[in-house]
Interface confidence: low
């Protein structure tokens, strides 16, 4: 057959769906790889063909569209499962072709199981709500196209595995869940379960997301350096280990790039002829404020090292900060010893 433009396995689209639930998967060709849509392709005489490779197999095989109740079907550029089964997991390929043209792409589909509390290996989207600020709404995601607008599904919302009823500041309303003045106690996993009827069959769509209540933009500040500071002096003798923490607080700022770094005599540590180790660690508060620490250590400090200028720097979307560490050589007090000189008198 003719050469086919093979876009390979599109691992950017690692699609995960729940077992025993409907799934509709659009062929990625029209969304990400080709400049035209399915309707244009179809009206130009191109045909969309689907096939798949089962998990842990190499053999490509056609998809069986003759299963009972049309469990798997294709509609325009969408592959439908009504519902999925665990062994539908595999790599799926959609190919657009006619006698002179061919283009195809594969993508992985993983069918995952959930327990009765909606726990599963599913990667969860994260919704961030600003603490103690106004009303935030989240909407049950990825349910468009599953049922016509004439169908009014029932929607039940859960926090963890508890149905949201009479919650202090959380109120479900159909596809939406409203948070009134969000609090840290609202952190957690929220699930909407959409139940609808299609041709006499009941289907459920389960969508879980993580809600994180984060610092408000009004609380955003430039970095604050806890350490080093003016109160602490790093006084060492040559040969001792010098350890200086650069510890910085960053208030939560959406999409802010927080960074800290050391300079030694105005240079990067790598550019200074000193055997330096730097270890970085990060911790987060409940509102995702960040404390970032870089510990600078010199195993055996020399007198020259103790004369250098060590500066901790920090930067976020709100600004920059820097703070020099007070480093000095410990003054060794003189040792008073009694010297008994036995003098041999000269004549």
């Amino acid at each position: 057959s003719e050469r086919c433009d093979d876009w390979g396995l599109d691992t950017m689209r690692q699609i995960q769906v729940f077992e025993d639930e409907p799934a509709r998967i659009k062929c990625p060709l029209f969304e990400h790889f080709l400049k035209y849509n399915y309707s244009t392709a179809h009206s130009s005489g191109l045909t969309l063909i689907w096939y798949w490779t089962r998990q842990d197999r190499d053999l490509e095989e056609p998809i069986n569209f003759r299963l009972p109740e049309n469990r798997i079907s294709k509609e325009k550029d969408v592959l439908w499962f009504r519902p999925t089964l665990l062994n539908d997991t595999g790599n799926y390929t959609c190919m657009l072709r006619n006698t002179t043209y061919c283009s195809k792409v594969a993508f992985p589909l993983e069918v995952v199981q959930k327990d009765s509390c909606f726990n599963s290996p599913m990667r969860l989207p994260v919704h961030r709500l600003y603490i103690e600020q106004g009303i935030h709404n989240i909407t049950c995601p990825n349910v468009d196209g599953y049922f016509p607008s004439s169908v009014k599904p029932s929607v039940t919302w859960y926090k963890g595995c508890t149905e949201i009823v009479n919650f202090h500041n959380v109120q479900p309303k159909g596809m939406n869940l409203s948070f009134f003045i969000p609090l840290v106690s609202n952190n957690g996993n929220y699930t909407c379960v959409v139940t609808y009827l299609e041709n006499g069959r009941l289907f459920h769509l389960t969508r879980t997301m993580t809600v994180k209540v984060v610092g408000s933009p009004k609380d955003a500040v430039p970095p604050h350096i806890y350490s080093p500071n003016d109160r602490v002096v790093y006084e060492k003798e040559p040969g001792e280990e010098l350890v200086i923490p650069c510890k910085v607080y960053f208030s939560f700022i959406m999409d802010s790039h927080n960074e800290i770094w050391w300079t030694i005599d105005g240079k990067k540590p790598d550019d200074v002829p000193v055997d330096i180790t730097i270890i970085e660690s990060v911790s987060y508060s409940s509102t995702e404020d960040e404390t970032r620490t870089q510990i600078l250590s010199i195993k055996k400090v020399t007198p020259e090292d103790l004369k250098r200028n060590y500066v901790c720097h920090a930067r976020n979307a709100e600004g920059e900060a820097e703070q020099a560490a007070k480093v000095k050589q410990k003054v060794i007090p003189p040792r008073y010893t009694v010297e008994l000189a036995c003098g041999f008198g000269a004549t």
């Epitope: 025993d20 009972p68 109740e69 469990r71 519902p83 089964l85 009014k152 029932s154 039940t156 149905e163 009823v165 009827l197 006499g200 069959r201 009941l202 459920h204």
Partner: antibody, heavy 120, light 107 residues
């Protein structure tokens, strides 16, 4: 504790009417589909009807369509079954049952049942 | 409507026995199947939902399996309290149909 308690059963003549009630407590009634299931003496179980959380959808077994009406009052946490044009084959214990798992259609809590006898 | 066929209709067994009850659907119902236990004069009690999920509080000697059209309820070691009627029920489609029941009696 989840509880469902049926009432309203009794003896009725063929062609007559009867209204069954089910009082629910111990759970958020308005969040659940509810069903009626019946069992004729010495026979198996038969699902009769169910109703969506907000009452906007109702389904019936073919044998009762047009004769039975399921309804609910969420404020009173009550479920009802209005039965008319009753026949001898409607004689059964009628159970009120809560549908579990978001209205999937299996029944996780049942009442103890109320007996309806259709006889002349 | 989907027909649910249970077998056997009566089963005689002894305490300690392993018992299997089967249920067949007239067409595929995926995993939309529940099992119930009913004792004389009592309401049915849910044992298994979604073909294999054990309802909370139900002893682990009860287990369910199957998907599509063939399902089984297994009692691994019969206890005196297990002698009762058992029903399967499909809930993939309206109407929600029950099997005709299996009466489990003491041998």
């Amino acid at each position: 504790e989840v509880q469902v308690v049926e009432s309203g059963g009794g003896l009725v003549q063929p062609g007559g009417s009867l209204r069954l009630s089910c009082a629910a407590s111990g759970f958020t009634f308005r969040s659940y589909w509810m069903s009626w299931v019946r069992q004729a003496p010495g026979k198996g179980l038969e699902w009769v009807a169910n109703i969506k959380q907000d009452g906007s959808e109702r389904h019936y077994v073919d044998s009762v369509k047009g004769r039975f009406t399921i309804s609910r009052d969420n404020a009173k946490t009550s479920l009802y079954l209005q039965m008319s044009s009753l026949r001898a084959e409607d004689t059964a214990v009628y159970y009120c049952a809560r549908e579990g798992y978001f209205g999937s259609g299996y029944f996780d809590y049942w009442g103890q049942g109320t007996l309806v006898t259709v006889s002349s | 409507d989907i027909q649910m066929t249970q077998s056997p209709s009566t089963l005689s067994a002894s305490v300690g026995d392993r018992v299997i009850i089967t249920c067949r659907a007239s067409q595929s119902i995926s995993r939309g199947l529940a099992w119930y236990q009913q004792k004389p004069g009592k309401a049915p009690k849910l044992l298994i939902y979604k073909a294999s999920n054990l309802e909370s509080g139900v002893p682990s000697r009860f287990s369910g399996s199957g998907s599509g059209t063939e399902f089984t309820l297994t009692i691994s070691s019969l206890q005196p309290d297990d002698f009762a009627a058992y029903y399967c029920q499909q809930y993939s489609y309206y109407s929600h149909t029950f099997g005709q029941g299996t009466k489990l009696e003491i041998k």
